[in-house]
Interface confidence: low
């Protein structure tokens, strides 16, 4: 076995300590080059130069309408994202020398993808569907069927199904059944109601004038007991909230065809929205 | 797949009126703008104007403003382009082109329009 | 309205040159511009978008850079089937305005 001198192996000690082994490896925020660890340039600057065993690294800050938003050695910023307004972009938030531009779509579209690079429009729902969630900036409307008892007459990306309108609440009667499309058609009272009703009227009245009259005649009879007190007719009191005197808010007539319409109170005629672009 | 298909050719006197129309399919019509570009026999291209169907909302090249009229039919996802007082100059190829998620990313196979007298 | 200058207005190049049209919008366009590749008697076709967004199904040969006012486009490797004219456009501002085209010839 080869001995060393005492000396050579302190002599190579000395040597290891003045001149390191190159790293492997640079500290968090640092980078290897030529054996050396240089510092990298912060968020919002670019690499000018490496450094050297005499110079730090030299950074340059981004110009306007770019960034970097990491620690880095990007010789080149990026360039802010251009929000298209012809592909329905606008800005939502501006860029900075640290972060980019963030695009989103113009009211009435929304992002095709995640990164919002364009936009499409909002889909509408067609008569007989009602919107059931409202579009956002990255998702589409969401139609529903409007169930029985509810219509859509529009095409619309805002609107709900609507209820149908509730006649008797305003002492109308259905003239004309609604669907999904169509609300209910209300009217007033119809002739037939009032033929029925009327003969009915004057039944009763009828019934008791006879009863009236028979009581009359008993009471003419001589009996040994004490006369009854003369009864007089009773006064019969006819409400005045009939169908067809109602007294209550007015309503507003329309002719559907020949006959009369009301256009239920606080609401109102709706007609298509039109879609902004 | 997306396709736009123009009407035929045709030959026209100055003075008069041509109406050109290009049928997309394979797309939502309604959900993206449609514009008109020509090129006329060895130049470039040009812009027109465009027209969003969903609205018939509609925007011109100042430079044919009173001349071109776009419109869009949603019923049968057709576009039309009318220019009128023609002139021997406005020879060209009409192309309809769809612009979207990228500009100008499909277009029409072209009708060319020959004015003469 | 917005001028895009294309040039040169043709050029000559042998298979597999390296090819760059240049085009020079009058004010900042950002990075919106597009090229299109047009051949005799067809209409265009999109192959940059955004400046430097290659679309789909164009091959990596194709490339665009730029941003403000001055643009690149390169063709890395001239192949015989991209004879054609190639215009660029800004998609910035309407009116959209197109360059005069390039027409690039095999030698």
């Known amino acids: 076995m080869v001995r060393l001198p005492l000396q050579c192996v302190l002599w190579g000690c000395l040597l290891t300590a003045v001149h390191p082994e190159p790293p492997t490896a640079c500290r968090e925020k640092q980078y290897l080059i030529n054996s050396q660890c240089c510092s990298l340039c912060q968020p919002g600057q670019k690499l000018v130069s490496d450094c050297t065993e005499f110079t730090e690294t030299e950074c340059l800050p981004c110009g306007e309408s770019e960034f970097l938003d990491t620690w880095n050695r990007e010789t080149h910023c990026h360039q802010h994202k251009y929000c298209d307004p012809n592909l329905g972009l606008r800005v939502q938030q501006k860029g900075t020398s640290e972060t980019d531009t963030i695009c989103t779509c113009e009211e009435g579209w929304h992002c095709t993808s995640e990164a919002c690079e364009s936009c499409v429009l909002h889909r509408s729902c067609s008569p007989g569907f009602g919107v059931k969630q409202i579009a956002t900036g990255v998702s589409d409307t969401i139609c529903e069927p409007c169930p029985v008892g509810f219509f859509s007459n529009v095409s619309s990306a805002f609107e709900k199904c609507h209820p149908w309108t509730s006649c008797e609440t305003k002492d109308l009667v259905v003239q004309q059944a609604g669907t999904n499309k169509t609300d209910v058609v209300c009217g007033p009272q119809d002739r037939l109601r009032a033929l029925v009703v009327i003969p009915i009227i004057f039944g009763i009245l009828f019934a008791i004038l006879l009863v009236l009259v028979f009581i009359k005649k008993v009471a003419k009879k001589p009996t040994n007991k004490a006369p009854h007190p003369k009864q007089e007719p009773q006064e019969i009191n006819f409400p005045d909230d009939l169908p067809g005197s109602n007294t209550a808010a007015p309503v507003q007539e329309t002719l559907h065809g020949c006959q009369p319409v009301t256009q239920e109170d606080g609401k109102e005629s709706r007609i298509s929205v039109q879609e902004r672009q | 797949q997306v396709q736009l298909v123009q009407s035929g050719a045709e030959v026209k006197k100055p003075g008069s009126s041509v109406k050109v129309s290009c049928k997309a399919s394979?797309?939502?019509?309604?959900?993206?703008?449609m514009h008109w570009v020509r090129q006329a026999p060895g130049q470039g291209l040009e812009w027109m104007g465009q027209?969003?169907?969903?609205?018939?909302?509609?925007q011109y090249n100042e430079k044919f403003k009173t001349r071109v009229t776009i419109t869009a039919d949603k019923s049968t996802s057709t576009a039309y382009m009318e220019l009128s007082s023609l002139r021997s100059e406005d020879t060209a190829v009409y192309y309809c082109?769809?612009?979207?998620?990228?500009?100008?990313?499909?277009w029409g196979q072209g009708t060319l329009v020959t004015v003469s007298s | 309205d917005i001028q895009m200058t294309q040039s040169p207005s043709s050029l000559s190049a042998s298979v597999g040159d390296r090819v760059t049209i240049t085009c020079k919008a009058s004010?900042?366009?950002?990075?919106?511009v597009a090229w299109y590749q047009q051949k005799p008697g067809k209409a265009p076709k999109l192959l940059i978008y955004?400046?430097?967004y290659r679309y789909t199904g164009v091959p990596s040969r194709f490339s665009g850079s730029g941003s403000g006012t001055d643009f690149t486009f390169t063709i890395s490797s001239l192949q015989p089937e991209d004879i054609a004219t190639y215009y660029c456009?800004?998609?910035?501002?309407?009116?959209?305005?197109f360059g005069g085209g390039t027409k690039v010839e095999i030698k």
């Open positions: 955004s400046a430097s």
């Open positions: 004010q900042d366009v950002s990075t919106a």
């Open positions: 082109a769809r612009w979207g998620l990228q500009p100008f990313a499909y």
């Open positions: 394979g797309y939502a019509f309604t959900s993206y703008w």
């Open positions: 027209i969003n169907p969903s609205n018939a909302r509609s």
């Open positions: 456009q800004q998609h910035y501002s309407t009116p959209w305005t």
